[in-house]
Amino acid sequence: ELCDDDPPEIPHATFKAMAYKEGTMLNCECKRGFRRIKSGSLYMLCTGNSSHSSWDNQCQCTSSATRNTTKQVTPQPEEQKERKTTEMQSPMQPVDQASLPGHCREPPPWENEATERIYHFVVGQMVYYQCVQGYRALHRGPAESVCKMTHGKTRWTQPQLICTGEMETSQFPGEEKPQASPEGRPESETSCLVTTTDFQIQTEMAATMETSIFTTEYQ
């Protein structure tokens, strides 16, 4: 059920998952000079049921220079969930941003975590694309990608998004202006044929990434 590859990369765009499906794993990685505490968790796991999901385990990092592994303890995932829920009801938080059923929110930062978070997505996970600052979107379809299982293999759908510099005015034939992504999917859910279009961009991630979930690192 784990997705084999990373979501596709689009030039001048960035993607994020706004919520993570149950079964998603997040490696507990620490930044240079720090390491996981002794007997600390290797990963966090999104678990739960249709009404309540949360991250099992917690990530904790300690200085590599110290032999003593005592560290300010981070809250258990349940405490983290409760704290975040409370904040959601505070005046500075929107009330309509509740978690999707069967999904976990982005875990709050932990001390001295690695710069990149390494997630292991499951089938059905969706990621959302946006053009980075200084670029605007030209697209014909959803600016999102979904991990799907097709004939026993996983693949990510191709987001129909092109990001162009703000000063450029070129548009697709027949397209008046960039619009919000329509609900419809640009490809069949059942077809096994995956065609490469002009919009398909090769991923820029290294193809020789380690397969172990604990050693995979993004560049």
Partner: nanobody, 130 residues
Framework: QVQLVESGGGLVQAGGSLRLSCTAS????????IGWFRQAPGKEREGVSY????????YYIDSVKGRFTISSDFAKSTVYLQMNNLKPEDTAVYYC???????????????????????WGKGTLVTVSS
Amino acid sequence: QVQLVESGGGLVQAGGSLRLSCTASGLTFEGYAIGWFRQAPGKEREGVSYITGSDASTYYIDSVKGRFTISSDFAKSTVYLQMNNLKPEDTAVYYCAVDRLGSRGGYASSWWRSGDMDLWGKGTLVTVSS
């Protein structure tokens, strides 16, 4: 547990200046957008400014452009908001917030404007009198 601690708020006359600080000890700044929201009494919260830890890209809401400047000192785990030429309409509680960057260290201002942040501070009150 990373916590966000704001300081620097206070009472100032219109046209005056304040510098807000947000300290986030232990935060890996390179993986986050860090910045400020504000909420005035009876008004909706709005994203004022952020700076990305990956490439120091900055964003400002239109109403503060040219008056506010965001900067960072990662060595001190602190982000600053220098607020000049303050106006009575800048009166609000200012909250520090962080949001995880997207793939390849990218970030989109629409994510900040959505207000769906990963972590919030408790806020510091800024009052601008006329």
